[in-house]
């Protein structure tokens, strides 16, 4: 096909008439279609909704959308035998039972299937014990608990709070402490914002509503049973006993409600400073166990769940490009929900369902798009990012070789104040050129662009006039593009304004109270800041799938790893005895970043000057950038995280959430002090250097000229 | 032979910011090869690496005191400075400046030392 063919009409007008397209009215009523009943993973109204899906980008016109499914490892709670905590006397009787259910939100009362709270992938057991309070469970929690105030979680079931960081870390920890049993709950400090009315009056999190979520720790291996390979018909699986990052001890959620019941009583130490303590009215004693009065009465969990392999349903879009159709950019995001996905996922998923309705009107009207464009409703999100990861394993040859760009479509909010972006540098200075050409939503700023409010709202800690933009970590479907497979991603949302908000994500997140009414009454009532998150999130695909030349600049990945290997050199520069000792330079590693930056600078010249016209030549420089984010990949993965192979960035090991930067040489320093062979820690720190040093410099190599 | 010399005041109170210069004497600060650092070793406590400049101005900051610390270089002096805001007790110590490899911490040249006490 010849290259006017996918641009009839001027490229401005295209965008225009594509930002246009999209309509706020149509997401509120998309996002009413998908909240009315649970939408679980593995379920029947799963499967019926991404029938629904199919049929209906079907009709927007999209080329062909079909079904991946995969049978994956899903845990769910047993129906006859409920899950609960109890406080039990000196005789076992029960004297205090946690809660079995949510109460259920006006106008859901009568609805079946709501899933009750659980901890997904908890193994059964009754375990029985003391209870020990270990603030948010982190690492540096145990630290304190451990080596300064010399308490042994040993035996014992530990309680910790919501927030800060990914609940399986939290799980890992307990269970790297020697704990039997873990409680999670929701603290009133993190998840009730001040002034603000709890559900349905307001957005904040009723005393008895509770955070569902699995508690893996997959490190990216996607279907426990099937790590590296597709979960399909033929697959071979592992014992439950070699199954990947399946916790060994129970794990349970309650609410603050049913967590003032077991705090009260708390006796032993108490807390180490004023971090430690939430907002309830107890004392936050850490223990070990109960109180003088309380002191033989013990805690005990009953978990029943059981982990079943399970069908689940990707529906995948397509939109063939006219001149590039080998060359893919993906817009995915998840169906799944743990209730009614009020906010995760169906905001994002309404987002995407009018992204391909506006996509699919330019189509009709004879317009297509220069690269191909792929849409994916992703399913088993909440259980794992299953969906997604089997997906990309099962095509992983097409996508690392066809790969231009991912942009992840989860909650198109999580609040209401300004935008927030993790991405790849190489999107940088496409967000930052995209937000300027769109209107903000904001009030006080009306006829500025979203990039002005953006900025003002949430400034770059380096760069003034700048807004910021954050490291991709993982807890979402963009990992195994990313992270694995080295392909360009990136996600937007709307957020709240963290420094008056300090509350973790928001209030209602995994709960039965994330309903259409909770955005339609409390975030978003004319939807206009999922109209800005349609605008950004399309704009951006309809960019890189577009413009002839990809719009990535590899100068900005020059900037940021100069700064990470600043950050790197100062922490190790922490130990600088042992530096000395161990011969420890990091000077391999800022050759390596000078020499990409200098490379990257004579390839944005050519870039600048070559002749567009040459298809082969356009081509040849297309592939450089697009393949420069594979070049950071790293066949062989990170120390014991074998689908963690970027090595610029990598979820942090100690919260999945987010983003570290040369994580490979981070771990390696993490802790040193305490490591018991010096050597042998420090001689991995340089490898690990090394690693890195190489990776930069083979990646600048790329961009070098070809001959 | 290379030499550098501290100078500062060696009593500062708390809460108020700490102020250190360092002559560095023959030789030039404008080599791309080497570092300059401010160190510090209180009573009981091993070496503290509190940061580093090159002679273009890049700085690079210990993690724990990076809120409160900066570090500028005057090449036409041939000196580099140290400004540590809001000291408390914690912060008494014996300061040195230092000359390191560039991307190591080969710290081949420092000065004597200087002793700063933080009381009221």
């Known amino acids: 096909k010849s290259s006017n063919e996918a641009t009839n009409i001027t490229p401005k007008h295209n965008m225009k008439a594509f930002l246009d397209e999209l309509k706020a009215e149509n997401i509120k009523k998309f996002l009413y279609n998908f909240t009315q009943i649970p939408h679980l993973a593995g379920t029947e109204q799963n499967f019926q909704l991404a029938k629904q899906i199919q049929s209906q980008w079907k009709e927007f016109g999209l080329d062909s959308v079909e079904l991946a499914h995969y049978d994956v490892l899903l845990s769910y709670p047993n129906k006859t035998h409920p899950n609960y905590i109890s406080i039990i006397n000196e005789d076992g009787n029960e004297i205090f039972n946690t809660s079995l259910f949510e109460p259920p939100p006006p106008g859901y009362e009568n609805v079946s299937d709501i899933v009750p709270p659980f901890s997904a992938f908890s193994p059964q057991g009754m375990p029985e014990g003391d209870l020990v309070y270990v603030n948010y469970a982190r690492t540096e929690d145990f630290f304190k608990l451990e080596r300064d105030m010399k308490i042994n979680c040993s035996g014992k079931i530990v309680i910790a709070r919501y927030g800060k960081v990914f609940r399986g870390n939290k799980v890992k920890n307990a269970q790297l402490a020697g704990a039997k049993g873990v409680i999670l709950y929701s603290d009133p400090a993190d998840y009730f914002a001040p002034g603000v009315k709890s559900y349905p009056d307001g957005w904040n999190l009723p005393g008895g509503g509770v955070q569902r979520g699995n508690i893996l720790n997959l490190n990216g291996a996607g279907d426990p049973l099937t790590p590296g390979y597709p979960a399909n018909e033929y697959a071979y699986r592992r014992g439950i006993a070699e199954a990947v990052g399946l916790p060994s001890i129970p794990v349970h959620p309650i609410g603050y409600y049913d967590a003032q019941k077991l705090l009260e009583k708390m006796g032993g130490s108490a807390p180490p400073d004023s971090s430690w303590r939430g907002s309830l009215k107890v004392p936050y004693n850490v223990g070990p166990g109960f109180t003088g009065n309380f002191s033989t009465q013990k805690v005990k969990m009953h978990i029943h769940s059981t982990n079943e392999v399970t069908r689940i349903y990707n529906v995948i879009g397509t939109l063939r490009g006219a001149v590039e159709p080998d060359r893919y950019v993906i817009l995915g995001g998840h169906r799944d929900s743990w209730v009614f996905g009020g906010i995760d996922p169906q905001s994002g998923a309404a987002v995407v369902h009018e992204i391909v309705r506006s996509f699919g009107t330019l189509k009709k009207e004879g317009w297509r798009p220069r690269r191909t464009i792929l849409f994916a409703s992703w399913d088993a999100e909440e259980f794992g990012l299953l969906g997604s990861t089997e997906w990309a394993e099962e095509n992983s040859r097409l996508l690392q070789e066809r790969g231009v760009a991912y942009i992840n479509a989860d909650s198109s909010i999580e609040g209401n104040y300004t935008l927030r972006v993790d991405c790849t540098p190489l999107m940088y200075s496409l967000v930052h050129n995209l937000t300027k050409e769109l209107k903000s939503p904001d009030e006080g700023f009306e006829g500025k662009s979203l990039y002005e409010s953006w900025t003002k709202k949430s400034p770059s800690p380096e760069f003034s006039g700048m807004p910021r933009i954050s490291k991709l970590g993982s807890g979402n479907d963009f990992e195994v593009f990313f992270q694995r497979l080295g392909i360009a991603s990136g996600r937007a949302r709307y957020t709240k304004n963290w420094e008056t908000n300090k509350f973790s994500g928001y209030p209602l997140y995994h709960s039965v109270y994330e309903t259409y009414e909770l955005v339609e009454k409390f975030y978003d009532p004319m939807f206009k800041y999922h109209l800005t998150v349609a605008q950004v999130r399309g704009g951006m695909v309809f960019e890189l799938a577009n413009s002839i030349v990809l719009p990535f600049d590899c100068r900005d990945y020059a900037v940021v790893l100069r700064k990470y290997a600043d950050k790197i050199y100062s922490i190790s520069m922490k130990h600088p005895q042992e530096m000395k000792t161990y011969s420890v330079s990091f000077d391999s590693l800022f050759s390596a970043v000078k020499n990409f930056t200098e490379i990257a600078s004579k390839f944005s010249e050519r870039l600048q000057d070559f002749d567009k016209s040459n298809p082969i030549v356009l081509r040849m420089m297309n592939d450089q950038l697009m393949f420069l984010e594979r070049a950071f990949i790293d066949p062989l993965g990170l120390p014991d995280r074998p689908f963690y192979r970027h090595v610029i960035y990598a979820p942090s090991s100690h919260n999945k959430y987010a983003g570290e930067s040369f994580p490979g040489i981070y771990d390696a320093l993490f802790d040193i002090e305490s490591k018991v062979d010096p050597s042998k820690a420090w001689g991995e720190v340089k490898r690990q250097i090394y690693v890195a040093a190489f990776t930069v410099q083979a990646a600048a190599e790329t961009l070098s000229e070809v001959a | 032979q290379l030499q550098l010399q501290e100078s500062g005041p060696g009593l500062v109170k708390p809460s108020e910011t700490l102020s250190l210069t360092c002559t560095v004497s023959?030789?030039?600060?404008?080599?791309?090869?080497y570092f300059w650092g401010w160190i510090r070793q209180s009573p009981g406590k091993g070496l503290e690496w509190i940061g580093s400049i090159d002679y273009s101005g890049y700085t690079y900051y210990n993690p724990s005191l990076k809120s409160r610390v900066t570090i500028s270089v005057d090449t036409s002096k041939n000196q580099f400075s140290l400004k540590l805001s809001s000291v408390t007790a914690a912060d008494t110590a014996v300061y040195n400046c230092?000359?390191?490899?560039?991307?190591?911490?080969?710290?081949?040249?420092r000065g004597q030392g200087t002793l700063v006490t933080v009381s009221s």
């Open positions: 230092a000359r390191h490899k560039a991307a190591t911490a080969d710290f081949d040249y």
């Open positions: 023959g030789g030039s600060i404008s080599s791309s090869n």
